[in-house]
């Protein structure tokens, strides 16, 4: 959410988050690495175009015009410099001058060697236990952010992985309208609209870069789960990977998997929505997962078919009015899974991404909780691979990504909530190998096996 250096009274009161990079002459002497020409402190640009009428509560939500409610000045980095203080490089670049191009490769989890599989699982577990080095999370809404005494900023440290969970929760949470009033639930800054793919792309990129830094390993990349198998089994749910089913409770993960020890965050929805608090770093119960176990809903007991991916990639238009979960002939709504794989909207259909989530039948199938199950990472890297293939095939045609009148948070130039520093949907609507420093090693049905460059 915000850099630790900005989670203080002075920064919040001034509305300025421009941390020093190397303040050799004392605090405030090198905002945004300005002394070495890396960046400067500038006014935040936030989308002010109208959103659709789904959301009638303008002025009530801290996420509106993100991040202006909190900060109106932040770092603008020059050239390929990036980060909250311009201390890192843009994705795909490295070196002291951020002028050397790099490319990491995201591969099918099942194609990794035993050592690589083990390394990935260990790395996820390390991310679950490692405090995020830069970011802290707010545990109260803006009006209560300075605490009961007006002097105690309500922020907490959180682990690298739980930060990944928290950002997703914050993007989907209801709008709190006041004590005693029902919170407004028809709002979602990361789903059911054009920003679905760009938001989740940045979400994964942030986790991947956090893990690269945590491991000191610039080549570290998130693998993917090709969930389009048409099977009724989860092929990555083995104890050497994401954990098999427990013999003691069919909704839990086997104790032979490290993930059986994981505890979820952001599960106290009722508390957040009635008291107006936010999810904090407190961990609760275990991950629940029961693949293909939803006997009351046979349609979600089998994963998508390989040809579903082939078909969805033939939908040429990125999105269509009303730019929502009932859009038809929309590639975004198709891959998100509210339309049939052919692109035709059908309210009864749950396909592709949505079907994979629902198939998991547990933590991974509940929007506010889903990233708590680390399969989420693999499910979304595959979804992102499909997105990147679409961008490659259709020359990243952004013309049907609406500039205005999308659901709130989904306009093309909206800063994706709650990422920091501010990043627009447009910035993620690019082919990954050329612009973001990663590629997929993937074989699309009916095509040769390639790295997506």
């Amino acid at each position: 959410q915000f850099p630790r250096e900005c989670a203080n009274i002075e920064a919040l009161r001034r509305g300025v988050c421009c941390p020093d990079l190397l303040p050799s002459s004392g605090p405030g002497t090198d905002p945004c690495g300005s002394s070495s020409g890396r960046g400067r402190c500038v006014a935040v640009i936030a989308d002010s175009r109208p959103h659709s009428r789904h959301y009638p509560h303008d002025g009530k939500d801290d996420r509106e015009a993100w991040p202006l409610r909190f900060f109106n000045r932040t770092c603008q980095c020059n050239d390929n410099f990036s980060g909250h203080n311009c201390g890192t490089c843009r994705p795909g670049w490295r070196g002291a001058a951020c002028n050397q191009k790099i490319l990491t490769v995201r591969r099918n989890l099942l194609d990794l060697s035993p050592e690589e599989k083990s390394h990935f699982v260990r790395a996820l577990d390390m991310a679950k236990r490692t405090t995020h080095p830069q970011f802290v999370i707010a545990t109260r809404r803006l009006e209560d952010i300075l605490g009961p005494d007006g002097n105690t900023p309500q922020f907490e440290n959180i682990s690298v992985y739980n930060y990944f969970v928290w950002t997703h929760y914050y993007s989907v949470k209801k709008t709190f309208l006041g004590t005693g009033q029902e919170s407004f639930g028809d709002v979602d800054f990361s789903h059911e609209g054009p920003a679905f793919l760009t938001w989740h792309r940045y979400h994964l990129l942030q986790l991947e870069r956090d893990m690269q830094e945590m491991l000191q390993e610039p080549s570290f990349s998130l693998p993917y789960w090709n969930f389009a198998t048409g099977k009724n089994v989860c092929d990555v749910c083995t104890d050497d990977l994401m954990g098999s089913r427990s013999n003691f409770d069919s909704t839990l993960i086997s104790p032979n998997s490290v993930f059986s020890q994981w505890r979820v965050v952001c599960e106290s929805l009722e508390e957040y929505d009635t008291l107006g608090t936010l999810c904090n770093s407190t961990e609760g119960g275990p991950i629940r997962r029961n693949p293909a176990g939803n006997v009351g809903r046979p349609a979600v007991q089998r994963l998508p078919e390989p040809q579903d991916v082939t078909q969805c990639l033939e939908v040429r238009v990125f999105d269509t009015p009303p730019f929502y979960s009932n859009s038809t002939d929309s590639f975004r709504n198709t891959v998100e899974g509210y339309s049939a794989p052919t692109g035709k909207y059908d309210p009864a259909v749950r396909s592709l991404h949505n079907l994979a989530h629902l198939f998991l039948n547990g933590t991974g199938g509940q929007t506010h909780l889903s990233p708590n199950d680390p399969i989420f990472v693999l499910l979304h890297t595959f979804t992102d691979a499909v997105f990147d293939e679409w961008l490659r095939r259709y020359n990243a045609d952004i013309s049907t990504f609406p500039l205005e009148n999308a659901p709130i948070g989904h306009n093309r130039q909206y800063n994706m909530v709650p990422f920091w520093p501010p990043v627009t949907n447009t910035e993620m609507f690019v082919t990954a190998p050329d612009n973001l420093g990663y590629a997929y090693e993937v074989q699309w049905p009916g095509q040769e096996f390639t790295v997506s460059e």
């Epitope: 490295r94 070196g95 002291a96 050397q100 191009k101 790099i102 490319l103 390394h119 390390m126 236990r129 490692t130 405090t131 830094e213 945590m214 491991l215 000191q216 390993e217 610039p218 080549s219 570290f220």
Partner: antibody, heavy 121, light 107 residues
């Protein structure tokens, strides 16, 4: 002045374990990753692993996983390498060294003097 | 794992000459490479990082170059004190393996 001062030579029996120390000065170990490297007699350098003293995270080369264990004591600015199940193949000089992660700098920039471990019955 | 193939294993040269040591990585390591010098009975000493940046205090007769999978360390105007073993090491992916070393002898 940056210094990494390693503990003295060790003579140990096969199957035993040994714990080597590396006391640092001139920098805060919480700001760096500390790596360990092995050099067998008349051989090249082998990377063992690293520890992040700020949070205790460790990563090992798979061939040292299970036999090497890295720990840190930030109050004394000291890192440790424990080796277990020693065999004559572990007879070597063990170096501690640090990595400056500023701008992802690819280098181990300061090294300890090394500790000689001899495994013999 | 990335393997580092270093060559030659040994070489002999005279004072004032120029020598080049090469390291080939089994995959692209994107300049995440360091070169070290180690004298007999001493600890390794950093010469070059990020493939081509000279470490503080290292004489300018040392230079690093290369990209992708091919890297080299050039020592011009050889001095007697340049004798010793030279190693490359990559930092692209775990584990951070070293090259096998080059023994440089000054005639």
């Amino acid at each position: 002045e940056v210094q990494l001062q390693q503990s003295g030579a060790e003579l140990v029996r096969p199957g035993a374990l040994v714990k080597l120390s590396c006391k640092t000065s001139g920098f805060n170990i919480k700001d760096y990753f500390l790596h360990w490297v092995r050099q067998r007699p008349d051989q090249g350098l082998e990377w063992i692993g690293w520890i992040n003293p700020d949070n205790g995270n460790t990563v090992y080369d798979p061939k040292f996983q299970g036999t090497a264990s890295l720990t840190a004591d930030t109050s004394s600015n000291t890192v440790y390498l424990q080796l277990s199940g020693l065999t004559s193949e572990d007879t070597a000089v063990y170096f501690c060294t640090r990595r400056d992660y500023t701008y992802e700098k690819a280098a181990l920039d300061y090294w300890g003097q090394g500790t000689t471990v001899t495994v013999s019955s | 794992d990335i393997q580092m193939s270093q060559s030659p294993a040994s070489l002999s040269a005279s004072v004032g000459e120029t020598v080049t040591i090469t390291c080939r990585a089994s995959g692209n390591i994107y300049n995440y490479l360091a070169w070290y010098q180690q004298k007999q009975g001493k600890s390794p000493h950093l010469l070059v990082y990020d493939a081509k940046t000279l470490a503080d205090g290292v004489p300018s007769r040392f230079s690093g170059s290369g990209s992708g999978t091919q890297y080299s360390l050039k020592i011009s105007s050889l001095q007697t004190e340049d004798s010793g073993n030279y190693y490359c090491q990559h930092f692209w992916s775990l584990p951070f393996t070293f090259g096998s070393g080059t023994k440089l002898e000054i005639k």
